[in-house]
Each structure stands twice: as C-alpha cells, then as structure tokens.
C-alpha cells in the first residue's frame, strides 16, 4: 500500500546554474494524498533557514505530483545560495534537501557602471 505521508522530492545536492536578469522558477515537487499541505520556501544562512516572506510563489498541479514554485522575476546576484522547501502536514514539519542556485552576473565589470554613473545617466 502506498504511503500517504507528504513527500518532498528535491534530490540531494541538486543545483541550478542560472543567469541574473532572467526569470527562473525553483520547483519543490510535493506528493500528497488528500489535503494539500502548507508549503514554504526558505534560504539557508549558515545553519539557519530564513523564511522567504515577500516572494512570489504558486502551485502547479500535475497528475501524480504537484509543484510548489518559487518565482524569481528576475534572478538577482543576491539570489545565489541554497534553498529548502518545507511542508506542514498534520502538525508535522517535513523538510526537503537543499537545492543550490549558482547565479552568474551576466554584466561584466566593464559594462556595469557604478551607482554614481548609473544615477548620472538619467540626467544626460
């Protein structure tokens, strides 16, 4: 008989290499039976995982599995790091393996002006 526990299917040591400035969706595959659990994303900061409060998320439902998606619109250099999704189910907290985003800043140092230069461009 198939287990009716909630399961989060992020593979151990999963990683994504992505570009800053473009959108990206980070998926947390969630398997559940009856009631969809409450799922959240957090970002690892040392040993603690800081809950991502003001970020856009959505659900994508497929036949045998659902995905809780964290949206990056767009990816920022600051998004580099490791993330984890967690599900609350019948008073139990289930945590996924962490998944790591490697963000490449597509703009080279020569192309990226300083903040002062950036500001002065508006008044050219």
């Amino acid at each position: 008989k198939e287990s009716c526990d909630v399961q989060l299917y992020i593979k151990r040591q999963s990683r994504h290499s992505i570009l800053a400035g473009d959108p990206f969706e980070l998926e947390c595959p969630v398997k559940y039976c009856a009631n969809r659990p409450h799922v959240t994303w957090c970002k690892l900061n040392g040993t603690t995982c800081v809950k991502l409060e003001d970020r856009q998320t959505s659900w994508k439902e497929e036949k045998n599995i659902s995905f809780f998606i964290l949206h990056f619109e767009p990816v920022l250099p600051n998004d580099n790091g490791s993330y984890r999704c967690s599900a609350n189910f019948q008073s139990n907290l289930i945590e996924s393996h962490s998944t790591t985003l490697y963000v490449t800043d597509v703009k080279s140092a020569s192309e990226r002006p300083s903040k002062d230069e950036m500001a002065s461009r508006f008044w050219a």
């Epitope: 400035g21 970020r55 767009p74 250099p77 950036m118």
Partner: antibody, heavy 120, light 106 residues
Framework: QVQLKESGPGLVAPSQSLSITCTVS????????VHWVRQSPGKGLEWLGV???????SYNPAPMSRLSISKDNSKSQVFLKMNSLQTDDTAMYYC??????????????WGQGTSVTVSS | QIVLSQSPAILSASPGEKVTMTCRAS?????MHWYQQKPGSSPKPWIY???NLASGVPARFSGSGSGTSYSLTISRMEAEDAATYYC?????????FGGGTKLEIK
C-alpha cells in the same frame, strides 16, 4: 548613451489591433529586459509586460490574453501587439529598460512614450 | 494583485516646508521604488529600493518604510520639487504603481 524610442500608429479603431515598436540604443537586448507600461487618465500607470534578455516574456494577467511581446535582438527592437482595442486602451505607451542591482530590480530608462487613441 | 494606495492624492507645500507622502501596500512587499513625473514628460526614477536616491536626486529627498508602509520625505520643499510622485512595487506580478501624489508649491 541609453535611449528607447517608441513608434506607434497614433489612432486605432475600436476592435482593431495595436502594434508598437520600441527601438533601443546604448545597450543590448540580450543583457537587459524591456518593459511596456501605459499611462491613461483613468487607470494611471499600468505595467503590461516584459521581454526578458533570454527571450522569455511575463505579462500582467489582466490584459494578458490580448497582449503579445516579441523582439529582434539584431535590430535592437521590441514589439508590443495588443488585440481587440477598446476606448479605455487610450493611453500613452512607454517602453522602459529594466536593470538589476545586487539585491533589487527596477525600471531605469523610459522612452518618451507614444500616444495611442482608440476612436472610430 | 498588490494594490498601492498613495496619500494624500494632492499635497500643497510652501518653500522650505517639510513634506511627507505615503504609500500603503495591500500585501507586504520587499521594497518600494518611487518615480517623479512632470507634465509632458516620462516618469523618472527617483528613489530605488525604498531608500536609495537615483543619481542627480537632491539629498533633501529620502525614502523609508518596510512591509506594507512606505514614505517619501522632502526635508525642505523647493519649487522644482513640484511634480507627481508614484510608488511602484516589484515583488509580485502584476507589478503595480500607486495612483500618485501630486505635489504643488504654495
């Protein structure tokens, strides 16, 4: 020097479609996103959608079904197409460059806008 | 969608006066941008990410806030500050603007 310039038809008949071209200079469409924002007296500023550097698009869900954004990187042009125009689509349409810093994203350079009036 | 409510809609201030306008979001946002627009011109970036002044913006301007409440302050009003100021959130699609605060000089 970064510049964006919109060119549109000016006048569109109700139920017809609108096509606006945004020609950019001073930056590459493969590095920066370009957004479409409109401003009407009734609705104020309204973000319509964006063409991301890699070629994906994101749209405002409200007018999304009528909107299409595309681009030609080699010509440094971004295109907005909107179908089934009504009188409340009358507005100034701006194309705007998007840029990111370390921890935030914003629209920095705005075109001068192109005025679109929907009327028979 | 996140609704941004700006108040007051119209604000009249004398030269030298301190001016504060607010922007309230219907849900929490990570940060707020502000744009200045004068009649016949495109909006100009004015304050980025809550408190970073865009280049060329006088130091008498400042921005603050968090969560659902943000504000733009002018320490001493000057005639050139008369314009409409819009707040703008980039936390959740659709990315919305406030209805604007029109700042007039007395």
């Amino acid at each position: 020097q970064v510049q964006l310039k919109e060119s549109g038809p000016g006048l569109v008949a109700p139920s017809q479609s609108l096509s606006i071209t945004c020609t950019v200079s001073g930056f590459s469409l493969t590095t920066y996103g370009v957004h479409w924002v409109r401003q009407s007296p009734g609705k104020g500023l309204e973000w319509l959608g964006v063409m991301w550097p890699g070629g994906r698009t994101s749209y405002n869900p409200a007018p999304m079904s009528r909107l299409s954004i595309s681009k030609d990187n080699s010509k440094s042009q971004v295109f907005l197409k909107m179908n089934s125009l009504q009188t409340d689509d009358t507005a100034m349409y701006y194309c705007v460059r998007g840029d990111y810093e370390y921890d935030y994203y914003a629209m920095d350079y705005w075109g001068q806008g192109t005025s679109v009036t929907v009327s028979s | 969608q996140i609704v941004l409510s700006q108040s007051p809609a119209i604000l009249s201030a004398s030269p030298g006066e301190k001016v504060t306008m607010t922007c309230r979001a219907s849900s929490s946002v990570s940060y707020m941008h502000w744009y200045q627009q004068k009649p016949g011109s495109s909006p100009k970036p004015w304050i980025y990410a809550t408190s970073n002044l865009a280049s060329g913006v006088p130091a008498r301007f400042s921005g603050s806030g968090s969560g659902t409440s943000y504000s733009l302050t002018i320490s001493r009003m000057e005639a050139e500050d008369a314009a409409t100021y819009y707040c703008h959130q980039w936390s959740s699609n659709p990315y919305t603007f406030g209805g604007g605060t029109k700042l007039e000089i007395k």
